[in-house]
């Protein structure tokens, strides 16, 4: 399975995409910016299989689509833009589903990492949280967009290691 | 290792222009804005403007709207300060520094180690 | 524009002294405050950022409080090395703002 190749492609395209998304200047929203808390170690360690890794990237990219699949999202940006982008996440998805039906015959340990999982799950709870209390304004939006472009970014250094290791 | 170099120290007339840069390494260079710092000798720091490498999208101090122009070229990682006419009083020290943006993160945590311009007739 | 006034504009003080200095902004900026150490001839330095956050690699003898308009910087056991002009910078919208700094000076 070469997941981490293709990933990483479609990887960049979801960057290209999220970052042609802007509709407003990000400078007049300074004041909007918040600390998330990317759970960064969930992608720092190197003790995962490599299925436990890909179940954790799954969860981001699952997690991102269905941020972007709402209708305040539908509402907010370019529907040309946003379909292409989940496209992509949705192709990324499937890819990832198959890679990890492939490596668990080929993998002794458990097929999901549930620590890292639910540190995902609930670093989207948190930005779906402040999108709420922000009521879903332009600002917020904007803060959101460049907060999944960084963890898709940090992500990215991720896959890489993970390639290294294969 | 972040980076970020200056070019080296200008002497000009009034009346001249001159563009300095800043070019960025050891990081995804259109992931953070860079923004501009003036010292005038003796004195504090005054903000000048700032740019967002990904797209050129800018934003300046009153201080400094119509006095300078902040560009970039994110395919050589450089931002770039120019003057179409310099004066006496432009003469100071240019710091450039990186700025995370929207993203929660230090704010200008790396800076370049400054360019001296000095304009004097 | 937001202004942001310090003090003092100096002081003086002996290695280990605990040194406060304090900055004021001219309306709420929330945490979004920022200060920086600067030596001649130098660039300057992050020392903290959102107002109480230890910007990585600086050491644990700085810290930073204060939220809305009255921030500090306290430097709790002065070192030979802190001899240096301090200055805070609002960050919560542009134009960005820095303090007049604060000169910290060997008594």
């Known amino acids: 399975c070469d997941l981490p190749q293709t990933h990483s492609l479609g990887n960049r395209r979801a960057l290209i995409l999220l970052a042609q998304m802007g509709r407003i200047s990000p400078f007049s929203c300074l004041k909007d910016r918040h600390d998330f808390g990317f759970p960064q170690e969930e992608f720092d360690g190197n003790q995962f299989q490599k299925a436990q890794a890909i179940s954790v990237l799954h969860e981001m990219i699952q997690q991102t689509f269905n941020l972007f699949s709402t209708k305040d999202s539908s509402a907010t940006w370019e529907q040309s833009l946003l379909e292409k982008f989940s496209t992509e996440l949705n192709q990324q998805l499937n890819d990832m589903e198959a890679c990890v039906i492939q490596e668990v015959g080929v993998e002794e340990t458990p097929l999901m990492n549930v620590d890292s999982i639910l540190a995902v799950k609930k670093y989207f709870q948190r930005i779906t949280l402040y999108l709420t209390e922000k009521k879903y304004s332009p600002c917020a939006w904007e803060v959101v967009r460049a907060e999944i472009m960084r963890s898709f970014s940090l992500s990215k250094i991720f896959q890489e290691r993970l390639r290294r290791k294969e | 290792e972040v980076q970020l170099v200056q070019s080296g120290a200008e002497v000009k007339k009034p009346g001249e222009s001159l563009k300095i840069s800043c070019k960025g390494s050891g990081y995804s260079f259109t992931s953070y804005w860079i923004g501009w710092v003036r010292q005038m000798p003796g004195k504090g720091l005054e903000w000048m403007g700032i740019?967002?490498?990904?797209?050129?999208?800018?934003a300046y101090s009153p201080s400094f709207q119509g006095q300078v122009t902040i560009s970039a070229d994110k395919s050589i990682s450089t931002a770039y300060l120019q003057w179409s006419s310099l004066k006496a009083s432009d003469t100071a020290m240019y710091y450039c520094?990186?700025?995370?943006?929207?993203?929660?993160?230090?704010?200008?945590?790396?800076w370049g180690q400054g360019t001296l311009v000095t304009v004097s007739s | 524009d937001i202004q942001m006034t310090q003090s003092p504009s100096s002081l003086s003080a002996s290695v280990g002294d605990r040194v406060t200095i304090t900055c004021r902004a001219s309306q709420s900026i929330n945490r979004f405050l920022n200060w920086y150490q600067q030596k001649p001839g130098k660039a300057p330095k992050l020392l903290i950022y959102?107002?109480?956050s230890l910007q990585s690699g600086v050491p644990s003898r700085f810290s930073g409080s204060g939220s809305g308009t009255d921030f500090t910087l306290t430097i709790s056991s002065l070192q030979p090395e802190d001899f240096a002009t301090y200055y805070c910078?609002?960050?919560?919208?542009?134009?960005?703002?820095f303090g007049q700094g604060t000169k910290v000076e060997i008594k």
């Open positions: 520094a990186r700025h995370p943006g929207l993203n929660w993160a230090p704010d200008f945590d790396y």
């Open positions: 910078q609002q960050a919560i919208d542009l134009p960005f703002t």
């Open positions: 740019i967002d490498p990904s797209d050129s999208d800018t």
């Open positions: 959102a107002a109480s």
